[in-house]
């Protein structure tokens, strides 16, 4: 019985120090835990250093360029978050572009596909609205993504839509049968057909970068 | 004695536990102890990267002001909501807005104020190259913020800064004296100078935000 | 009916100036295409100039180009051809002509209008 | 020098079927419509084909056009003593933005 009781008194004092043991190596772990994070931290902030040391050096060695790129860097850097690229109009679901040149329908269909953009669609009398106020201050003619084959066959935009007939009246070569098919543009406020070889402004229309930031 | 032999063997096996914990702890400290060496090691590698880093930077800011802007604007430019509002263009630093409507200098002022910025000023030769772009397509007279009380005043801008000769030439009725000043207009790709009383289209500029979210 | 009538045509000294109207009656003016074409005595048909419904489309004959000034007034159904610096070989009767499309072919034609260019 | 070439002159005794042809290049011809003009002495042209071989109404069916390549030309069967004029070709040349016409083709019924 006096055995028992000495027994039973070393055992609780081993139990509570492997008790202590434990909470030590528990307290440990979690000092190892947040040592490990604050080393993937440190690594994290020395690849961002070094990172930032390297670009810091290639600057320093193009700076005879960088004027020249300012311009393309920024439209590089920037798209991924601007609604549209530099240059062009934002206007609520998409961004258009008005041509600097003068060149014919497929031309000016080409020019819009090379930038990831097609040539103006007019979904409702809205857009019409804000194109008709932002060419107010032209009298020349754009090319809007609308054409036709010949006057036997619908108006269509370039995605194969039909064009929805209370949205304008097309005037002028309605009538015209062409070799190179028959192409809307707009003028003034007013929609005109006309032979598709003729050169003019353009209008390119892309939707907007409007995902969440 | 079964008690006893069962709390000898409970003891023995408590006293294993105990030892080996001590292991772990011994062990657990020798890594702890690594890790804060390899973490001074880190921290002075940081310090070392960022010396450098600190080195590089004070060598590019003695560099021309607008290599050092590329790399704010880029900084900037990384994580940016739209950079313009709706109907705007955005190009390079700088919003522009085309008014849609024909007014008095004075007036085309007051509505570019209203909407947080002044009337068009033209920096620099790139600056007068995106304009005269922009524009290529009206045949219409832009009012910009350019404007000066009499022929024997200089030209200055809304900011009160002079216009840099080199940029442009004024053409027109630059020696004309009118009881509301003489005010500049782009008009394709020239600069004129005319009555700042007669109605003209606009041009409205501000700071795109460039600003890091 | 389909109606043009010009009108501005006479004698000029070279180098100077005249003005020539054609008044258009009897179809939607906006919905077509005008042109100028000139017919020098004894010879053929020149095309002068060309202007699309509202202006935006214009060209010249090579000949012209710099001289002659093609515009029109919707609201008067009416088209001018202002011709400046004018030359012996400008002499011809200017006819102006209705197209249904800018590059296609002239279904009306005006009586035209005699200018003579001499000193 | 006109941009299109047509023979000076063409004859043809009544009833009989004559053609003008008209000669232009890809830019013209090659790539657009052709219209023709009849031009009676003393007025001023009146047209008598469109889109190559479209007549418009009240123009006789003795009268068609027809296109090859670069070549268009004119036909009229059963040559009437009224038909003798001056005719026209035309066409748009997208090169050079402008509208070209033939130097014209006298044509005599004889007889």
């Known amino acids: 019985s006096q055995v028992s009781n000495l027994l039973k008194q070393q055992q609780t004092n081993l139990t509570h120090q492997k008790n202590k043991l434990e909470g030590q190596i528990s307290a440990r772990q979690q000092a190892e835990e947040a040592s490990q994070e604050s080393q993937n931290e440190l690594k994290e902030m020395i690849e961002t250093l070094a990172w930032k040391l390297n670009e810091k050096s290639k600057e320093q060695m193009e700076l005879h360029h960088q004027n020249l790129n300012l311009q393309e860097t920024l439209k590089r850097v920037a798209n991924c978050s601007a609604p549209c690229p530099q240059d062009w109009i934002w206007h609520e679901e998409n961004c258009y572009l008005f041509s600097t040149g003068s060149f014919n329908w497929e031309k000016s269909q080409e020019k819009c596909l090379s930038l990831d953009a097609k040539l103006l669609k007019i979904n409702s009398t809205a857009d019409l609205d804000f194109i008709q106020q932002a060419i107010s201050y032209s009298s020349f003619p754009f090319w809007m993504g609308l054409s036709r084959r010949n006057p036997s066959y619908p108006w269509l935009w370039e995605d194969g839509s039909p064009l929805m007939p209370h949205l304008f009246r097309i005037r002028g070569a309605v009538s015209q049968t062409y070799p190179s098919g028959t192409c809307a543009y707009i003028q003034r406020g007013a929609v005109y057909a006309e032979n598709c070889i003729l050169a003019a402004f353009s209008i390119c229309q892309k939707k907007a970068n409007l995902r969440a930031q | 004695s079964q008690v006893s032999n069962l709390l000898k063997q409970q003891q023995t096996n408590l006293t294993h536990q105990k030892n080996k914990l001590e292991g772990q702890i011994s062990a657990r400290q020798q890594a702890e102890e690594a890790s804060q060496e390899s973490q001074n090691e880190l921290k002075e590698m940081i310090e070392t990267l960022a010396w450098k880093l600190n080195e590089k930077s004070k060598e590019q800011m003695e560099l021309h002001h607008q290599n050092l802007n590329l790399q704010e604007t880029l900084k900037r430019v990384a994580n940016c909501s739209a950079p313009c509002p709706q109907d705007w263009i955005w190009h390079e630093e700088n919003c522009y807005l085309f008014s849609t409507g024909s007014f008095n200098w004075e007036k085309s002022q007051e509505k570019c104020l209203s909407l947080d910025a002044k009337l068009l000023k033209i920096n620099s030769t790139a600056d007068l190259d995106f304009i005269q772009q922009a524009i290529s397509y009206s045949s219409f007279p832009f009012w910009m913020g350019l404007s000066r009380r009499n022929p024997s005043y200089p030209w200055l801008w809304e900011d009160g800064s002079p216009l840099m000769p080199h940029l442009f030439r004024i053409r027109g009725a630059v020696s004309q004296t009118y009881p509301s000043g003489t005010c500049a207009y782009i008009q394709r790709g020239a600069v004129y100078a005319e009555n700042c009383i007669l109605a003209a289209f606009s041009i409205c500029q501000k700071k795109a935000n460039l600003r890091a979210q | 009916q389909v109606q043009l009538l010009e009108s501005g045509g006479g004698l000029v000294q070279p180098g100077g100036s005249l003005r020539l109207s054609c008044a258009a009656s009897g179809f939607t003016f906006s919905d077509y295409a005008l042109h100028w074409v000139r017919q020098a005595p004894g010879k053929g048909l020149e095309w002068v100039s060309v202007i699309s419904y509202q202006g935006g489309f214009i060209y010249y004959a090579d000949s012209v180009k710099g001289r002659f000034t093609i515009s029109r007034d919707n609201s008067k159904n009416t088209l001018y051809l202002q011709m400046n610096s004018l030359r012996a070989e400008d002499t011809a009767v200017y006819y102006c002509?209705?197209?249904?499309?800018?590059?296609?072919?002239?279904?009306?034609w005006g009586q035209g209008t005699l200018v003579t260019v001499s000193s | 020098q006109s941009v299109l070439t047509q023979p000076p002159s063409v004859s043809g005794a009544p009833g009989q079927r004559v053609t003008i042809s008209c000669s232009g290049s890809s830019s013209n011809i090659g790539s657009n419509y052709v219209s023709w003009y009849q031009q009676l002495p003393g007025t001023a042209p009146k047209l008598l084909i469109h889109?190559?071989?479209h007549r418009p109404s009240g123009v006789p069916d003795r009268f068609s056009g027809s296109k090859s390549g670069t070549s268009a030309s004119l036909a009229i069967t059963g040559l009437q003593a009224e038909d003798e004029a001056d005719y026209y070709c035309q066409s748009w040349d997208y090169e050079s933005e402008r509208v070209v016409f033939g130097g014209g083709t006298k044509l005599t019924v004889l007889g």
């Open positions: 889109s190559t071989s």
């Open positions: 002509a209705r197209s249904p499309g800018l590059t296609s072919y002239h279904d009306s």
